[in-house]
Amino acid sequence: RQQWELQGDRRCQSQLERANLRPCEQHLMQKIQRDEDSYGRDPYSPSQDPYSPSPYDRRGAGSSQHQERCCNELNEFENNQRCMCEALQQIMENQSDRLQGRQQEQQFKRELRNLPQQCGLRAPQRCDLEVESGGRDRY
């Protein structure tokens, strides 16, 4: 069994290395920013169309395209729940230093947990997405 787990870990590692999780990160960041925009919460202006200024914020094309590409990537982990969890943890780790507020971090985690389901995939039952609060600058 130990041998099998070792092979499983190696397989997961190589899957993670092959995977391009950026579309998932882009989709999630757009989603939580768009949610803030639509409620007019600080620092966004409620009077302003939140989607027009940035090429990354257009409601349709950009985000749904990212979601589609993200789901294609996550699909690779469908048969390995532990590996799916590691992919989600990697997404959280990659974006944690972009989230400098408790609210933003919690919202990102919430959306991240829902991601497999949004893609029509099984969500890992137990998956710890905790990072050090406020993220890290890793340069």
């Epitope: 620092p43 200024p53 507020g101 408790r102 609210q103 050090e132 600058d137």
Partner: antibody, heavy 118, light 111 residues
């Protein structure tokens, strides 16, 4: 109404220490990263330090690393900047600022002047 | 360390006329999440700085729509479509990709 009020500035001799405070009200102080930024006379803005909302992560500009320490007291809604081994080039108006949650400096205090001179 | 270079350093303007400030970064400010981590701030005489534009092109709450930000990667621009007397002050770009650093500032004054 959002208010950030800095205090603790004054005249100090080179090599000495000073502690700045920033009292926050009307904002979710404990939910956001907080920053210190300074502006020296006749110069531009310089980011000095930041601390994450939980206080776990601290970031410093190279110019103050090892000399300045940023901290926060959530029970008092107060941000601090402990400045040791002060130099003449640390003379500036020091502002505290609250992060927007996405790495922008959204709310600013009115500033406190620190003068390092013998 | 990322270095931001603003130009011009001084900008005499005429009320009602457009104005623009450039900010060039020593490295790309696009994060892997697709956003450009570049902000614009204005410090009016005798006041604290205020956020105008964040993530290169998003206007902060309460900022008049005559202010707009554009650019991606290493080249960014702040435009004022029609300058008003109250727009005088020092404008700074700031990168937030790796910790935080400001450009040297552009002083905008009425001709």
């Amino acid at each position: 109404q959002v208010q950030l009020v800095e205090s603790g500035g004054g005249v100090v001799q080179p090599g000495r220490s000073l502690r700045l405070s920033c009292a926050a009200s009307g904002i979710a102080f404990n939910d956001y990263t907080m920053h210190w930024v300074r502006r020296a006379p006749g110069k531009g803005l310089e980011w000095v330090a930041a601390i994450s909302y939980g206080g776990t992560n601290k970031y410093y500009a190279d110019s103050v690393k090892g000399r300045f320490t940023i901290s926060r007291d959530s029970s008092k809604n107060t941000l601090y900047l402990q400045m040791n081994s002060l130099r003449a080039e640390d003379t500036a108006v020091y502002y505290c600022a609250r992060d927007s949650g996405y790495r922008s400096l959204l709310h600013w205090g009115q500033g406190t002047l620190v003068t390092v001179s013998s | 360390e990322i270095v931001l270079t603003q130009s011009p350093l001084s900008l005499p303007v005429t009320p009602g006329e457009p104005a623009s400030i450039s900010c060039r970064s020593s490295q790309s400010l696009v994060h892997r999440n697709g956003y450009n981590y570049l902000d614009w701030y204005l410090q009016k005489p005798g006041q604290s700085p205020q956020l105008l534009i964040y993530m290169a092109s998003k206007r902060a709450s309460g900022v008049p729509d005559r202010f707009s930000g554009s650019g991606s990667g290493t080249d960014f621009t702040l435009k004022i479509s029609r300058v008003e007397a109250e727009d005088v002050g020092v404008y700074y770009c700031m990168q937030a990709l790796q910790t935080w650093t400001f450009g040297q500032g552009t002083k905008v004054e009425i001709k």
